[in-house]
């Protein structure tokens, strides 16, 4: 088992909104849970976009999940990752 590296980034989306993206890379096996939490509970699936789990060329895998949020509300959101029985949460950078 190889644990993922998780990285959260933000980018401007439209006026007053930003897109936050949570990327997991370098993990094996390919099964992974990656999702956003808002106010400590699950964010509805229809407001999240998931990338495919793809090989990254090193025998490991990568994927991502993104959502659009209001600028200034970053503190309400965390990315949750679970892989091979281990899990972690990752805040949006200020």
């Amino acid at each position: 088992t190889v644990p993922p590296m998780v990285n959260v980034t933000r980018s401007e989306a439209s006026e007053g909104n930003i897109t936050v993206t949570c990327r997991a890379s370098g993990f094996y096996p390919w099964n992974i849970t990656l999702s956003w939490r808002q106010d400590g509970v699950s964010l509805s699936h229809d407001t999240q976009q998931w990338g495919d789990v793809l090989p990254d060329g090193n025998g490991t895998y990568q994927t991502w999940v993104a959502t659009r949020i209001c600028q200034g509300e970053e503190q309400r959101f965390t990315c949750y990752m679970e892989h091979s029985g281990n899990h972690s949460t990752h805040p949006v950078p200020s």
Partner: antibody
Framework: DVQLQGSGPGLVKPSQSLSLTCSVT???????YYWNWIRQFPGNKLEWM?????????NYNPSLKNRISITRDTSKNQFFLKLSSVTTEDTATYYC???DGRGAWFAYWAQGTLVTVSA | DIQMTQSPASLSASVGETVTITCRAS??????LAWYQQKQGKSPQLLVY???TLADGVPSRFSGSGSGTQYSLKINSLQPEDFGNYYC?????????FGAGTKVEIK
């Protein structure tokens, strides 16, 4: 270390409003986290009532309809519960508690305040 | 709303025994589950979150497991201080709800 302390009257008459205070020490309620009220009925059933967040937003249990209000006084580092039009069914031990944005589990609780609704 | 059904409602066990408490959710809660212990006259104390993670200071004889709608709390080698009520709580969505509790008595 953060500490929460609940306080308020132990006896409220039916149809009146129940008002409780949670005083927080060791952490500013505007910095982060979600500041909640939870109650436990006789018989031990637990019910989440709602929260006020670090940013001042609220989320309430729909079962309490329009009877609940959670507010705060940032200068005193306190948050408050107001429950209107109480009945004997609102007799319970009331707890204030905190969770963080990683997940809505309650790592910090105040001691309970028993509130009896009776004429 | 997601309903949480706990079983058994009560149990009695001897010191050193292993006991298991189960919690069933009315929908898939994807491991968004916490367990608490409450002793008479005290506030609940967090034991487990995210279904499997022990909270700080919780003895390793406690363990959480499960997925989907079915979750368990296991106490290995029950100790006298483990008596009390145990509750599960989901945090998949609002409103947050708790199980009705399991009373653990020491024989």
């Amino acid at each position: 270390d953060v500490q929460l302390q609940g306080s308020g009257p132990g006896l409220v008459k039916p149809s009146q409003s129940l008002s409780l205070t949670c005083s927080v020490t060791g952490y500013s309620i505007t910095n982060d986290y979600y500041w909640n009220w939870i109650r436990q009925f006789p018989g031990n059933k637990l019910e989440w009532m709602g929260f006020i967040s670090f940013g001042g937003s609220n989320n309430y249990n729909p079962s309490l309809k329009n009877r609940i209000s959670i507010t705060r006084d940032t200068s005193k580092n306190q948050f408050f519960l107001k429950l209107s039009s109480v009945t004997t069914e609102d007799t319970a031990t009331y707890y204030c508690a905190r969770y963080d944005g990683r997940g809505a589990w309650f790592a910090y609780w105040a001691q309970g305040t028993l509130v009896t609704v009776s004429a | 709303d997601i309903q949480m059904t706990q079983s058994p409602a009560s149990l009695s066990a001897s010191v050193g025994e292993t006991v298991t408490i189960t919690c069933r959710a009315s929908g898939n809660i994807h491991n968004y589950l916490a367990w608490y212990q409450q002793k008479q006259g005290k506030s609940p104390q967090l034991l487990v979150y995210d279904a499997i993670t022990l909270a700080d200071g919780v003895p390793s004889r406690f363990s959480g497991s499960g997925s989907g709608t079915q979750y368990s709390l296991k106490i290995n080698s029950l100790q006298p201080e483990d008596f009390g009520n145990y509750y599960c709580q989901h945090f998949w969505s609002f409103p947050l709800t708790f199980g009705a509790g399991t009373k653990v008595e020491i024989k």
